[in-house]
């Protein structure tokens, strides 16, 4: 299913009816939905653990900011926001004996930095995107995807891993963020909320969308994920927001119709190959980009995030199927599987289009023009 293109002057347009309007006043976040910048208590004092593969002796990734003085060393990212009613409770949690620091869950113990020290890094994901503050970067060209239209055979593995539903992708799906920035797709997974509660990871001006798709890619400069982890640009994720629309999305239905088969945590099924690009917005030219991290442990940094301006429409029934079918460990529903937004700590989000030019009511506020760092610099 191909989606209508959004208006040129409407960052992240597309309401529940699939129209071209930007987010209206009724979409403004409630207070508890706002990005949280405060530090969680006690996380500064967490014991360290062995570094993750590929992160040894690496210099700190430089933020995309002209003024490094704007970074405060005392700032730590918000790893958990248990007080946020939107945050999941008791999900993806394993009751296992023994000292197991590698289990993790959303919205509770153990604190993620104890699971992986990288989760306390300064340049974490997801983040709140403020189009008005994004730096327009003409060097950001349309994304190039090759080989994403898969034949029905061989079939692909669809798995409920306890904290998401994940589709493993075969070799041959190539993606370029620009000249010399080539990647191959590894897997895709989704993040969602619960009935009446949105569950995207990234937010836009504090607005959380119903769900979000992530397509994870490995740089062709690396043979393996563990070699690329923590290396700047080693991994790249394409992210798109999922919204409610009037019609069933036939591409997503190929996956959603199989979720009942993998309702149980740890279960998997085989699904026919499909057009992976049909799961993404049709406009590959308008997007936001920044350097962040994996949004789940090990939270490795150096990940290039590309968040589409255009959204993808699913029917209300499809969004309900996504959020109400799967189970995590311990007889808990797999819902609200998103991480709280993390502070930018001086990072500048770049836009491939002039996102600050906005006809919405919010355009009245002064626009801060951030400068663009040419891609690859």
């Amino acid at each position: 299913q191909r989606l209508p293109r959004m208006q040129e002057d409407s960052p992240l347009g597309g309401g529940s009816s699939g129209e071209d309007d930007p987010l209206g006043e009724e979409d403004l976040p409630s207070e508890e939905d706002s990005p949280r910048e405060e530090d969680p208590p006690g996380e500064e004092d967490l014991p360290g653990e062995e570094d993750l593969p590929g992160e040894e002796d690496l210099p700190e990734v430089k933020p995309k900011s002209e003024e490094e003085g704007s970074l405060k060393l005392e700032d730590l990212p918000t790893v958990e926001a248990p007080g946020d009613p939107q945050e999941p409770q008791n999900n993806a949690h394993r009751d296992k004996e023994g000292d197991d620091q590698s289990h993790w869950r959303y919205g509770g113990d153990p604190p993620w930095p104890r699971v992986s020290p990288a989760c306390a890094g300064r340049f974490q994901s997801p983040v709140d995107i403020r189009p008005q503050l994004a730096a327009f970067c003409p060097a950001l060209r349309p994304l190039e995807l090759l080989g994403f239209q898969l034949p029905p055979l061989p079939e692909l593995r669809l798995r409920n891993n306890g904290h998401s539903v994940q589709l493993t992708l075969p070799p041959g799906l190539e993606m370029a963020l620009g000249p010399g920035r080539e990647y191959r797709a590894l897997q895709l997974h989704l993040h969602w909320g619960a009935a009446g509660r949105p569950g995207s990871e990234h937010t836009v001006e504090g607005h959380r969308f119903p769900a979000e798709i992530h397509v994870v890619h490995l740089s062709t400069a690396f043979a393996r994920v563990d070699e690329a982890l923590g290396r700047p640009g080693g991994l790249a994720v394409l992210a798109a927001f999922l919204e409610e629309g009037p019609e069933e999305n036939s591409a997503y239905e190929q996956l959603l119709s199989r979720l009942e088969e993998i309702a149980e945590e740890g279960s998997e099924t085989q699904v026919p190959g499909l057009d992976i690009s049909a799961l993404l917005p049709s406009d590959f030219s308008r997007y936001f980009q920044y350097e962040g991290s994996l949004t789940t442990p090990p939270c490795a940094q150096g990940v290039i995030w590309t968040v589409f301006n255009q959204t993808v429409m699913l029917s209300a029934k499809q969004l309900h199927t996504l959020s109400d079918t799967l189970w995590g460990p311990g007889d808990s529903r797999l819902q609200l599987n998103f991480r709280a937004t993390q502070p930018l700590n001086g990072r500048v989000i770049e836009a491939s289009f002039p996102a600050g030019v906005d006809s919405s009511p919010r355009a009245a506020e002064p626009v801060q023009l951030n400068s663009c760092l040419a891609a690859g610099d």
Epitope: E155, G162, Q166, P170, P171, L186, P298
Partner: antibody, heavy 122, light 107 residues
């Protein structure tokens, strides 16, 4: 360089429980799958099972009722217990590192221990 | 459970010759989850190929893997003395299985 070392008793009596531990050195145990494989003398390789560092497990269906695996990330170790052993469980037992992250992306078992011989006999 | 059948059971060749080893699966296997190992007497197996065709770190380019679906092949373009060993294919899914092995011996 990651290295694996199996340890445990070399002799186990029939009907008892075989217990082995694999110690990971030179790298972190976290976020990998860890496998046990066995090989009877002069025969082929048989996969016993795997554990992810979250505690998630998959076992060989033919051994599932007798196998338990656990992981202790604080000690960089994972363990195998095989109950109600018989002479047919006599083999060299290997531990090996498998895929990274719960991403279902597979790179093969790229690091192996040297193996430990377990004999089941009274 | 996916059964992997390797053939031939034994391959008798001379150094410098080309070795072609076959692995057939009882049902379709994603290329992402097909690996090949080499094992010499008294040693642990060594990963040669993963993802059906990707060479593991440090593996010479005379080793190559190919195939998809149910038929996979390991090719050693020019046998060196140290290549005489037993070779196993392996599939990795929710359960893992190994083939029975092919012994490559000196003719």
């Amino acid at each position: 360089q990651v290295q694996l070392q199996e340890s445990g008793p070399g002799l186990v009596k029939p009907s008892e429980t075989l217990s082995l531990t694999c110690t990971v050195s030179g790298g972190s145990i976290s976020f990998y799958y860890w496998n046990w494989i066995r090989q009877p003398a002069g025969k082929g390789l048989e996969w016993v099972g795997r554990i992810y560092t979250s505690g998630s497990t998959n076992y060989n269906p033919s051994l599932k009722s007798r196998v338990t695996m656990s992981v202790d990330t604080s000690k960089n170790q994972f363990s195998l217990k095989l109950s109600s052993v018989t002479a047919a469980d006599t083999a060299v037992y290997y531990c090996a590192r498998g895929g990274f992250l719960e991403w279902d992306y597979y790179y093969g078992m790229d690091v192996w221990g040297q193996g430990t011989t377990v004999t089941v006999s009274s | 459970e996916i059964v992997l059948t390797q053939s031939p059971g034994t391959l008798s060749l001379s150094p410098g010759e080309r070795a072609t080893l076959s692995c057939r699966a009882s049902q379709s296997v994603s290329v992402t989850y097909l690996a090949w190992y080499q094992q010499k007497p008294g040693q642990a197996p060594r990963l040669l190929i993963y993802g059906a065709s990707s060479r593991a770190t440090g593996i010479p380019d005379r080793f190559s893997g190919s195939g998809s679906g149910t038929d996979f092949t390991l090719t050693i373009s020019r046998l060196e003395p140290e290549d005489f060993a037993v070779y196993y294919c392996q599939q990795y899914g929710s359960s893992v299985t190994f083939g029975g092995g092919t012994k490559v011996e000196i003719k």
